[in-house]
């Protein structure tokens, strides 16, 4: 039930915490974790619904 | 769909250990933080604590040494222990999911309302 | 920990009616990493809370576009358009981005007038 990582910086962190593409980073401890750890959104195929518009999937968010 | 589903005793007596669990079905509780927060009477919500990914825990500092969260990967489950209970313990306890994209409590229990009296 | 002060307590209202709930947090919720984490929920009698705006500005999924959520560095408001109905319950707000402890406002009860 993994929502795998994403790559695509959005508009609305200007400053985002750098990390690699495959990695998230976590408020809670302050740094870049595995995204498969966090609790992040899936890509779904065209046409699902989504649990949230993330029109901004950024994993430095 | 993740769901979520708080058991325990509804009536605890004063200076008593609540123990609450949280089953959890849609997602693994190997992933992500999982939390525990309830609501008092008159609509207060206190952030009680989680447990992490990696077993990890974060107790809110006005519980003291008195509550534990822990876990169960092989039931998929997570559990509270509040000891030496008292009437101002008397609430609705949820556990919840959180986002870890935006950080927002996406997934909450139904609640389970949990009273402290002798 | 951060105190997140919301008001009013209490706001009654007219089914078609605006209705406009503040939120003050002690700290600017503007994270280093440049996003504000503040978010709102309601929670419907009986129910448990449910997200309603997340990251001050953004509508969960489902919610009408009847909600909306404006503010920056303490200040914030949610309105509703126009009230239903269904509508009716607490309003909290929160804050993600001084954690941990989360914390969440005192709740603004909507009720009818």
């Known amino acids: 039930m993994r929502r795998g990582p994403r790559s695509l910086r959005g508009r609305d962190a200007p400053a985002p915490t750098p990390c690699v593409p495959a990695e998230c980073f976590d408020l809670l401890v302050r740094h870049c974790v595995a995204c498969a750890l966090l609790r992040t959104p899936r890509p779904k195929p065209a046409g699902a619904s989504s649990p949230a518009p993330r029109t901004a999937l950024q994993p430095q968010e | 769909d993740v769901q979520l589903q708080e058991s325990g005793p509804s009536l605890v007596k004063p200076s008593q250990t609540l123990s609450l669990t949280c089953s959890v079905t849609g997602d693994s509780i190997t992933s992500g933080y999982w939390n525990w927060i309830r609501k008092f009477p008159g609509n207060k919500l206190e952030y009680m604590g989680y447990i992490s990914y990696s077993g990890s825990t974060y107790y809110n500092p006005s519980l003291k040494s008195r509550i534990s969260i822990t876990r169960d990967t092989s039931k998929n489950q997570f559990y509270l222990q509040l000891l030496s209970v008292t009437t101002e313990d008397t609430a609705t306890y949820y556990c919840?999911?959180?986002?870890?994209?935006?950080?927002?409590?996406?997934?909450w229990g139904a609640g389970t309302l949990v009273t402290v009296s002798s | 920990d951060i105190v997140m002060t919301q008001t009013p307590l209490s706001l009654p209202v007219s089914l078609g009616d605006q209705a406009s709930i503040s939120c003050r947090s002690s700290q600017s919720l503007v994270h280093s990493n440049g996003n504000t984490y503040l978010h709102w929920y309601l929670q419907k009698p009986g129910q448990s809370p449910k997200l309603l705006i997340y990251?001050?500005?953004n509508r969960f999924s489902g919610v009408p576009d009847r909600f909306s959520g404006s503010g920056s560095g303490t200040d914030f408001t949610l309105k509703i358009s126009r009230v239903e109905a269904e509508d009716l319950g607490v309003y909290f707000c929160?804050?993600?981005?001084?954690?941990?402890?989360?914390?969440f406002g005192s709740g603004t009860k909507l009720e009818i007038k």
């Open positions: 990251k001050v500005s």
């Open positions: 929160s804050q993600s981005t001084h954690v941990p402890p989360f914390t």
């Open positions: 919840a999911g959180l986002d870890g994209l935006y950080w927002y409590f996406d997934v």
